[in-house]
Amino acid sequence: IWELKKDVYVVELDWYPDAPGEMVVLTCDTPEEDGITWTLDQSSEVLGSGKTLTIQVKEFGDAGQYTCHKGGEVLSHSLLLLHKKEDGIWSTDILKDQKEPKNKTFLRCEAKNYSGRFTCWWLTTISTDLTFSVKSSRGSSDPQGVTCGAATLSAERVRGDNKEYEYSVECQEDSACPAAEESLPIEVMVDAVHKLKYENYTSSFFIRDIIKPDPPKNLQLKPLKNSRQVEVSWEYPDTWSTPHSYFSLTFCVQVQGKSKREKKDRVFTDKTSATVICRKNASISVRAQDRYYSSSWSEWASVPCS
Amino acid sequence: RNLPVATPDPGMFPCLHHSQNLLRAVSNMLQKARQTLEFYPCTSEEIDHEDITKDKTSTVEACLPLELTKNESCLNSRETSFITNGSCLASRKTSFMMALCLSSIYEDLKMYQVEFKTMNAKLLMDPKRQIFLDQNMLAVIDELMQALNFNSETVPQKSSLEEPDFYKTKIKLCILLHAFRIRAVTIDRVMSYLNAS
């Protein structure tokens, strides 16, 4: 058993049929010695008396809020949560496996630049009685500070018969140099509590590997005389690291109709303009990627050919 | 400890081309190592990230773009002095700080060159003959060093009398290649910045 936060404890259980469970001793936080009784949740049934209560925790029915009282007055609470371990593996029932970039990916993180700011998100089908707490650091043995905000519900989607909820959190490394060469990864730890179930999820990454620039901005077209070609120009996104001559981007320019199966014109360039062939009912799209370290491409920025 | 904005004439920076070749060569070599040594811990997640130039050179700090010198987190107290005569400087106006940056890059290359050559000598003794260093990568390191053209004491190639542990050597190769790729990215960014200035 260990303390998650004040008055909230996590009991780690090997989860299999007829498991013996864990013996837990609760102590009432009071100077009083006599006349103390214990109850669980809303029940008035007295579970025991005395300053300590010993319980055998085997299942979710044994978890919950234990309260010690004296003469009708509440003295203190202890909330017991269960953390299940099945076949030596901690349970991952609360969050959905996003399977990208690999199986067992529950947390996904992205950074728009090298400032040390990043966003992580996760998915669940659970809609109520759900709380998250996020901590982060650079390295684990001698951790350096990363400050994370509160996790918030950022999107709801319908997937077949199910609703899916996306939560996200923003974090900022306390003293980040955009030009630094990372040797210790960022560690992100998410505590998830659903009713009386506790789970934790972790992710470890270098900012350089989770870079995904915002799409290029201010796309403009200029038709070329006596030709089917148009010159398309754009600018670096505002959120990208500066100076741009140091943090350079490379771009992919594509002309395509509405269907992915349609024919297309595609060209890669390090410049902020390109000449392509425009077709009726097609769009010109441009996306960006770090020129020197190939992490993710940005989403497309698009303008219609016409 | 930072680069001035007024540097060589645009497009006249001979090291940019070499630094692009360097990044390409080390990236290819790393990809080859990851494929060939697929049953060894050779991915970014699996290896320890070591920097053989730590406390010996200060490339990131010495080559910091002017715009980042206002960022407290980028200013490190480490100071290293180097010999300052380089042909990549391409202009008499080039400041001492830029010479410091380029000589720091030169020292990095020299250290990696020695490590890679020592390692290759060991890998050539491996009866499995599983992986060797790409001669193109070693040539590209050499070309960039020549373009930088700094006078510097030659570092003797390390020789070891004991029987090489090929497993450890291959893991060290992965660690070195990962670190060198990160440094090659920094070098490319620096050369691009200098070329644009």
């Epitope: 089917r228 014109d265 595609r266 060209v267 890669f268 360039t269 062939i277 077709r279 | -």
Partner: antibody, heavy 118, light 107 residues
Framework: QVQLVQSGAEVKKPGSSVKVSCKAS????????LHWVRQAPGQGQEWMGW????????EYAPKFQGRVTITADESTSTAYMELSSLRSEDTAVYYC???????????WGQGTLVTVSS | DIVMTQSPLSLPVTPGEPASISCRAS??????LHWYQQKPGQAPRLLIA???QSISGVPSRFSGSGSGTDFTLTISSLQPEDFATYLC?????????FGQGTKVEIK
């Protein structure tokens, strides 16, 4: 299986014209750009131009502008390349090639040898 | 027009050995470079698109690298069927242009 089948070899006199055909099978004809590329004996490949069979849009290499005409007939899934004012240096194997991507070629015809000789 | 220069023009290689062919552009073309294989009396066959993207059906021994002006096609271990002429082609701008070809011959 996508295939491009070209017309047979031609022998032409200088100053005359030649029209080479390229019939496509497999896939929808108008879903691809169609190019013409030539290779003179002992020389490298030379790109001549492309057509979008969907709308008839064409673009030609400046070297051939005014001398080459590329057309397409959607009803027969056939593209044509006509080269006029032939000279001996136009002796080459002419290839048609196609792709959904405009700027490179994933399927080629077998080639048509055009010999220009007096 | 962008001029594409291949080297060497002829490359004698022992079967089973690796081979590298170089292609240089007269100006920077990013990764807009494609590689083809051509055998005598046959049409070219696409091997690599955009400098390094493999093409389905092409053996994994063929790989490409490079960007800007310098590109390389590598054949990790030459098989008897790989002896042919290899062409590079730029797609950075029109007119599309090809290298003059590198003939890989049996040593």
């Amino acid at each position: 299986q996508v295939q491009l089948v070209q017309s047979g070899a031609e022998v032409k006199k200088p100053g005359s014209s030649v029209k080479v055909s390229c019939k496509a099978s497999g896939g929808t004809f108008s879903d691809y750009y169609l190019h013409w590329v030539r290779q003179a004996p002992g020389q490298g490949q030379e790109w001549m131009g492309w057509i979008d069979p969907e709308n008839g849009d064409t673009e030609y290499a400046p070297k051939f502008q005014g001398r080459v005409t590329i057309t397409a007939d959607e009803s027969t899934s056939t593209a044509y390349m006509e080269l006029s004012s032939l000279r001996s240096e136009d002796t080459a194997v002419y290839y048609c090639a196609r792709n959904k991507e405009l700027r490179y070629f994933d399927v080629w015809g077998q080639g048509t040898l055009v010999t220009v000789s007096s | 027009d962008i001029v594409m220069t291949q080297s060497p023009l002829s490359l004698p290689v022992t079967p089973g050995e690796p081979a590298s062919i170089s292609c240089r552009a007269s100006q920077s073309i990013s990764i807009n470079l494609h590689w083809y294989q051509q055998k005598p009396g046959q049409a070219p066959r696409l091997l690599i698109a955009f400098a390094s993207q493999s093409i389905s059906g092409v053996p994994s021994r063929f790989s490409g690298s490079g960007s800007g002006t310098d590109f390389t096609l590598t054949i990790s271990s030459l098989q008897p069927e790989d002896f042919a002429t290899y062409l590079c082609q730029q797609s950075n701008s029109f007119p599309l242009t090809f290298g003059q070809g590198t003939k890989v011959e049996i040593k």
